[in-house]
Amino acid sequence: YDFTNCDFEKIKAAYLSTISKDLITYMSGTKSTEFNNTVSCSNRPHCLTEIQSLTFNPTAGCASLAKEMFAMKTKAALAIWCPGYSETQINATQAMKKRRKRKVTTNKCLEQVSQLQGLWRRFNRPLLKQQ
């Protein structure tokens, strides 16, 4: 999906009001020095691409994020504020239902959510190169 035509300001507002708080809840008890951000993004569409990938695509050691509250709210925000996003996700959602696993918060998931917080931070404040 190409995130270029999303309403970035509406997504940002949704992030600040709810999604960010759910991410903080998920990370509660984790030291702020624990994880270094290794995934980066260069502009808002790129940030949303990376956010979608880390939120909804199972990775080795962390298969369960898509069922978390922050993920469901992310999905809702993208569906509302990114034209045509919902349609592209129908097949992906059906495939996800088939491989639903029980929720387990692993250290790998905590690291992945820390990366997500970093991506959202850059989505909110992309530091574009100065001419």
């Epitope: 940002k12 624990e34 270094n36 931070r121 850059r122 100065q130």
Partner: antibody
């Protein structure tokens, strides 16, 4: 806990340069932007610029472009602001600040470094 | 650059009063506005981000509102520790700029 410890007060002559340090602790230094802001005596807050400590990318206010250099040393978790060609109107308190978890504000500030420029 | 204008520049009020400070942006900044409180000789402290979200540890008597170009910070019942200078700042795009400040004094 998160702390930004700035270097001590400086007195400089017009035309000289100054380098102010801001040592970060209590968080992953490279994950958050560091901003620099100044405040002249009895005046408001003025944004100077920002650095991404991970990449070294910077963005400066047009007013300071060419006179200010922001750097970061990842090994010591320290950010630096160097201001050259000093003039009397640069006399101010200089603050470093860390961007918040959400990237939508500054949540922690240094205690400030007082710069006096006088002949 | 986006200009931020605060009003009033100073304000006298009493403990228990309800006060509102306004901030106007020279162009649409959506909800990308922050409010800080600063006391003499100290660094500013974050009160509100995203125009209406209260920062951790900030008393509920503070509230922010507005979007686009018009914003306000309201203190519902002034406490002695609230007498300070308040600044708005846009967080829309680099370069960031601050408002001109509002000094809140005891009447």
């Amino acid at each position: 806990q998160v702390q930004l410890q700035q270097s001590g007060a400086e007195v400089k002559k017009p035309g000289a340069s100054v380098k102010v340090s801001c040592k970060a602790s209590g968080y992953a230094f490279t994950n958050y932007l560091i901003e620099w802001v100044r405040q002249a005596p009895g005046q408001g807050l003025e944004w100077i610029g920002v650095i991404n400590p991970e990449s070294g990318d910077t963005y400066y206010s047009e007013k300071f472009q060419g006179r200010v250099t922001l750097t970061a040393d990842k090994s010591t978790s320290t950010a630096y602001m160097e201001l050259s060609s000093l003039r009397s109107e640069d006399s101010a308190v200089y603050f470093c600040a860390k961007e918040s978890l959400t990237g939508s504000s500054y949540d922690y500030w240094g205690q400030g470094t007082t710069l006096t420029v006088s002949s | 650059d986006i200009q931020m204008t605060q009003s009033p520049s100073s304000l006298s009020a009493s403990v228990g009063d309800r006060v509102t400070i306004t901030c106007r942006a020279s162009e649409n900044i959506y909800s990308n506005l922050v409010w800080y409180q600063q006391k003499p000789g100290k660094a500013p402290q974050l009160l509100v981000y995203g125009a209406r979200n209260l920062a951790d540890g900030v008393p509920s008597r503070f509230s922010g509102s507005g979007s686009g170009t018009q914003f306000s910070l309201t203190i519902s019942s002034l406490q002695p520790e609230d007498f300070a200078t308040y600044y708005c700042q846009h967080f829309y795009e680099t370069p960031l700029t601050f408002g001109t400040g509002t000094k809140l004094e005891i009447k």
